[in-house]
């Protein structure tokens, strides 16, 4: 997991300043408002569990 300004996160993940780590874009289905999701694909998340 990289610090901001170094190599980007691996494919399918995006940097979260809140958590200070790369986060899986898959998590945006559950947490679409996460700061990491700003860097993920623009497709809208599928409806989540509830």
């Amino acid at each position: 997991e990289q610090a901001p300004g170094t190599a980007p996160c691996s494919r399918g993940s995006s940097w979260s300043a809140d958590l200070d780590k790369c986060m899986d874009c898959a998590s945006c289905r559950a947490r679409p408002h996460s700061d990491a999701c700003l860097g993920c694909a623009a497709a809208p998340p599928a409806p989540f569990r509830l």
Partner: antibody, heavy 119, light 111 residues
Framework: QVQLQQSGGGLVQPGGSMKLSCIAS????????MSWVRQSPEKGLEWVAE??????????HYAESVKGKFTISRDDSKSRFFLQMNNLRAEDTGIYYC??????????WGQGTDLTVSS | DIVMTQTPASLAVSLGQRATISCRAS??????????MHWYQQKPGQPPKLLIK???SLESGVPARFSGSGSGTDFTLNIHPVEEDDTATYYC?????????FGGGTKLEIK
Amino acid sequence: QVQLQQSGGGLVQPGGSMKLSCIASGFTFSSYWMSWVRQSPEKGLEWVAEIRSKSDNYATHYAESVKGKFTISRDDSKSRFFLQMNNLRAEDTGIYYCSSTYADYFHYWGQGTDLTVSS
Amino acid sequence: DIVMTQTPASLAVSLGQRATISCRASQSVSTSTYSYMHWYQQKPGQPPKLLIKYASSLESGVPARFSGSGSGTDFTLNIHPVEEDDTATYYCQHSWEIPYTFGGGTKLEIK
């Protein structure tokens, strides 16, 4: 270094109550959803309850088998969370683990604590 | 609730060979992009440890001998080559909806 330190558990009589605690360190506790997962030879690994983060309005969810009996809560200021268990029955016996999840998978786990419900 | 069925219940594999564990969900746990299936390893007296997230993404620090695949309802965990230290019980778990449910486990023994 991430740690989830559990306390509570032990022997309790049927119909009794018990409170489990979990203190977290080494990660951004307030941003994570927290769960309790239990394990028994009869039922294997079983998710019990979840409490989400402040940004998710501290929403809580429970397994059907514990709804109305168990209450999950958290204290972000002290990086700890709890499971209050009431009206315990023999089928609640097992090892209880606290665990953190950002969204989907159980990332960090406590060491586990034994609960035995027996007269 | 989504029922997770793991096979086999137990497995004995020779050192250096391949171990294959299957997990079937009672309904799809995948979108067009991601599968909400995860794998854990548990050794006696220890909590489960995350190995694979989202069906095929290796958790940080987990050896590349572990790999996951599948989508929809059918998923597989492969370990190759197996090592002595891989003796454990392996579980799948979905996060498609609440309640999250786990498979019944596969106990791996190394011959």
